[in-house]
Each structure stands twice: as structure tokens, then as C-alpha cells.
Amino acid sequence: HNTTVFQGVAGQSLQVSCPYDSMKHWGRRKAWCRQLGEKGPCQRVVSTHNLWLLSFLRRWNGSTAITDDTLGGTLTITLRNLQPHDAGLYQCQSLHGSEADTLRKVLVEVLADPLDHRDAGDLWFPGESESFEDAHVEH
């Protein structure tokens, strides 16, 4: 999986979208989890409604919300009132039984200021940035 970077500004909201094949993942609940280390587990932050048919209903855990457009095939996560400690590597997951498929790896960056964006022009709108190839050097 490539990693998609989403950048937001501290104190503001950030919306993360994870597109997927709606037929392939039909009937599956989704989840948003945080990778806590190179080899550590992905710690569940929030998951969609227990009843798949109600996945469109927004579910909150603290300042993080999740909602799933199961027909369109888009999982949306909202991080409200972004703080620096919200930055990190996350995953959108599709759940089946005790297994989880990674839909997208997401790197959330929280900037102190919109102008901190490294390619900032006169105006910069928070959101999705380019994808980066995974390039992990083994030691």
C-alpha cells in the first residue's frame, strides 16, 4: 500500500476519505485505527455502526467521527479540533470476522499554520496531499 498524506491545521477539522470497491467489501463494517509503531498493532479508534445497513450513521469516539457510503464506496473520517498529537500513521480498514483488510494507509499531519505547508502558495486548503511510496529502511 502507498501512503496518502492528509494535512490539516491545528484547531481546525480534517476530513479523510478512503475509497474502496463497494462490491468487494459489500456487507463489511469499516474501522479507523492508528499504527503505534513499525511493528506494533493498529489501535482501533472508531468503527462504523454494528449494523452494516446503518453504516451511513456517523459514529463518534471523542473528536473522531466515521461514516460509510456503502453504495458509493467511500469511507469518511472526520477529525475535529485537530491537535498536534493527532498526527500519525493510520489505516482505513474493512472488517470481516476477526480479520481486517487495509483499504488505505493514511498519514495525518497537523500543521501549526496553513503557511507551514511545504508547497504553500498564496492560499492553501487543508486536505489530501500526494501519495508517497513506502520506503522503509530495514536496520
Epitope: 513499525e38 491537535q83 498536534p84 498529537h85 500519525g88 499531519e109 505547508h117 522503509h136 536496520h139
Partner: antibody, heavy 119, light 107 residues
Framework: QLQESGPVLVKPGASVKMSCKAS????????MNWVKQSHGKSLEWIGV????????SYNQKFKGKATLTVDKSSSTAYMELNSLTSEDSAVYYC??????????????WGQGTLVTVSA | DIQMTQSPSSLSASLGERVSLTCRAS??????LSWLQQKPDGTIKRLIY???TLDSGVPKRFSGSRSGSDYSLTISSLESEDFADYYC?????????FGGGTKLEIK
């Protein structure tokens, strides 16, 4: 794990670029912070860089004074300070953050680089 | 910016004594606080993060706690290598800020 460059003596108005070479971990996986300590004083956070993307966030106080960069190929973080004055004479530390974040603070610190600004 | 008010600024204590240092946050930091130790040679080491989690390799005589906006570092029984400068750091929001420091000296 974090090896900083040696002490420097620079003239007022000049610039200085110091380095922080990382080893023993995947450089791009961990944020790098820079911190200033003036003689006999407390610590001040200058800013942070994500080595994976190059994205930076600065303390407003150091915007325009400090520039943070990385060289992924050599696992080295850099901080450049410009238009130096006596107020910039201090020890500067690099401090590693946590996995793609600073959500557990700064676990590892460099030994510090002493910058002296004097005519 | 969040102000971290650290007290006392200096403290003289004897070997084996129990001491406590405090940092008060001017705004809510939700436990995003760590304690750092700086030795006379300038070396900085993190002792505690998330207000109360002890770093691996740090002696059990160090502990961290929280009461509202007050955060404390306690050393249960001072040893010679504990005489150093101590700082708190809040990493809840930008810009990250440090306490003014506590110089712990031998009485």
C-alpha cells in the same frame, strides 16, 4: 542515536547550519524537533519536521529565523539559523519525536550544538 | 501559548529524601506532559511521558502524577545521580512549551 555537529563561532549577521545525524532506527518514521537553550535558561521549542514528507511546523517566535530540512539519504536533519545576533548564542538540541508524530513527546535527544555569536 | 509554571525553581535536598516538583498548565493539556532530566554536561533524558508513564530504564523511584492542571514529578528517595535540572514539557498544542526548570542540589 542522534549525533549533532560540533560547536561553532559565527559573526553577527551571518548564518549557520547545524546537523543532527540519526542512526539505529528508520529515520523517516519519526518526527524531528529542534530546541533552543540559552545560557542558564530554560528550553524553547523551535519547530518540528516530518522527515517522510518534509512538512514543518514552527514556533511563531522562530519563523524567519530557523529553517528545518532533512536529507533522507544520509538520515540527517538540519537547522539553519540566519541573520545571527548575540540573542542566538545558545545550545541547540535535536530531539526525536514518536512514530510519525509527537504524541509521546521527545524520547531521544542529541547532545546539543553550541552556537556562539561574536564579532 | 500554553504557559507551564514550574516550581520550585531550585531545591536543596539530602540523599534518601523524598522530593516533588510541580508544573501547572495555563490551559488544558489532557496529560500530554513529559518530564526531562538535564545533567550538568547538558545531556537531556526523558523520564516520564503521558504525565505518569515511566520511560524504560528509568528507576522506579521516579513517578509522575496529575491533579487537574497540576502535574508532579516525585523522586521517592534521592540518589547522588539525581542531582540535576528538571523540566516539564507540554506537547498538547503548538507551540510546545517547557517549564522554567528546577535545579535540584545536594544539601
Amino acid at each position: 542515536q542522534l549525533q549533532e555537529s560540533g560547536p561553532v563561532l559565527v559573526k553577527p549577521g551571518a548564518s549557520v547550519k547545524m546537523s543532527c545525524k540519526a542512526s539505529g532506527y528508520t529515520f523517516t518514521d519519526y518526527y524531528m524537533n529542534w530546541v533552543k537553550q540559552s545560557h542558564g535558561k530554560s528550553l524553547e521549542w523551535i519547530g518540528v519536521i516530518n522527515p517522510y514528507t518534509g512538512a514543518t511546523s514552527y514556533n511563531q517566535k522562530f519563523k524567519g529565523k530557523a529553517t528545518l530540512t532533512v536529507d533522507k539519504s544520509s538520515s540527517t536533519a538540519y537547522m539553519e539559523l540566519n541573520s545571527l545576533t548575540s540573542e542566538d548564542s545558545a545550545v541547540y538540541y535535536c530531539a526525536r519525536g514518536t512514530y510519525y508524530s509527537n504524541y509521546e513527546g521527545f524520547p531521544y535527544w542529541g547532545q546539543g550544538t553550541l552556537v556562539t555569536v561574536s564579532a | 501559548d500554553i504557559q507551564m509554571t514550574q516550581s520550585p525553581s531550585s531545591l536543596s535536598a539530602s540523599l534518601g529524601e523524598r522530593v516533588s516538583l510541580t508544573c501547572r498548565a495555563s490551559q488544558e493539556i489532557s496529560g500530554y506532559l513529559s518530564w526531562l532530566q538535564q545533567k550538568p554536561d547538558g545531556t537531556i533524558k526523558r523520564l516520564i511521558y503521558a504525565a505518569s508513564t515511566l520511560d524504560s530504564g528509568v528507576p522506579k523511584r521516579f513517578s509522575g502524577s496529575r491533579s487537574g492542571s497540576d502535574y508532579s514529578l516525585t523522586i521517592s528517595s534521592l540518589e547522588s545521580e539525581d542531582f540535576a535540572d528538571y523540566y516539564c514539557l507540554q506537547y498538547a498544542s503548538y507551540p510546545y512549551t517547557f517549564g522554567g526548570g528546577t535545579k535540584l542540589e545536594i544539601k
